[in-house]
């Protein structure tokens, strides 16, 4: 009986010779838990593990802590890979994070962080980021230093309000901060002056709700 080949991320999938975009099964070392993730094998050299995607509003992102922990949605469409998997993965080696954004006028931009990891669940999956480059703003729209993750049933933000309830979606809210890529999806021509939309302030400014977002990770030095 041959040994089962398992992949921890899409970079390993790519290096094994699978260079086609699509959904792959990933497993962490010393674990039997599997997750289904979309692998982008074309953008910037390929090997990207997609950890979040918004594109059409088909999936509800106002979810519980547990749902954000394990992931939800459809890996071929809108989804969240899961904080626990991403936390464990990004603490095993150094990862970069690329955030790709689309507006309703046909423009695209990105933010690239040269080092990204999430703390453990005990530390509320706090986000850690370093080294920003890209076209989606010279200042990080994810507040620095990083905040704890909050959901509608887990208020870990720095606001007198409950940001996740006010803005909808789970995110690394400050009070509430310059971004929320898990906010309410608004269609074209209804996407401005929104208090709870898909926000990336240092690219599109206040109240602008984006058309599409993708968050992807890859080992540094891939």
């Amino acid at each position: 009986k041959g040994e089962q080949i398992s992949f921890r991320d899409c970079a390993e999938v790519f290096k094994s010779g699978h260079t086609t975009n699509g959904v792959y099964t990933l497993t962490l070392p010393n674990s039997t838990e599997e997750v289904k993730a979309y692998c982008d094998m074309e953008a910037g050299g390929g090997g990207w593990t997609i950890i979040q995607r918004r594109e059409d509003g088909s999936v509800d992102f106002q979810r519980t802590w547990k749902e954000y922990k394990v992931g939800f949605g459809n890996p071929s469409g809108e989804y969240w890979l899961g904080n626990e998997f991403v936390s464990q993965l990004t603490n095993q080696q150094r990862y970069v994070l690329k955030i790709h954004l689309k507006d309703w006028e046909g423009n695209e931009a990105y933010s690239l962080y040269e080092h990204f990891y999430l703390s453990s669940e005990e530390l509320n999956y706090r986000i850690h980021l370093k080294g920003l480059t890209g076209t989606a703003g010279k200042i990080s729209s994810i507040s620095q230093p990083g905040n704890d993750f909050s959901t509608k049933d887990a208020d870990n933000d720095k606001c007198i309000c409950k940001c996740s309830q006010m803005l909808t979606g789970g995110w690394w809210f400050d009070a509430c901060g310059p971004s929320n890529l898990n906010g309410m999806y608004y269609p074209q021509r209804q996407n401005t002056n929104k208090f709870n939309g898909i926000k990336w302030y240092y690219w599109k400014g206040s109240g602008y709700s984006l058309k599409g977002t993708t968050m992807m990770i890859r080992p540094a030095g891939f």
């Epitope: 720095k158 606001c159 309000c161 006010m166 009070a175 926000k199 206040s206």
Partner: nanobody
Amino acid sequence: EVQLVESGGGLVQPGGSLRLSCAASGFTLDDYAIGWFRQAPGKEREGVSAIRDNGGSTYYADSVKGRFTISSDNSKNTVYLQMNSLRPEDTAVYYCAAVPAGRLRFGEQWYPLYEYDAWGQGTLVTVSS
């Protein structure tokens, strides 16, 4: 649909006065803070004044303290900025913007610019002789 419409701008001589209005629709002022901002050509947008809690809390930038007064009429869902003793350096496009009043950091009194998610189109104020 959330809308903010500014009016009242115009040309005024130094030392003169203007009253700007910000009419809000799609939400009620009771639960929101309204800020006035201005942007002069080639300069960053800056906060001028803000109001919340039915006028219970107000903020003024140092450059306008004693000259500008912010007020609200919640029955008309409108916020006003009375500007007296105007100076040439007050020349700018003036914008009003809204933020949910509760979106405050622990220990803070006012809001960073990026928290104001709804904006008007602006009204031009020119102070010149």
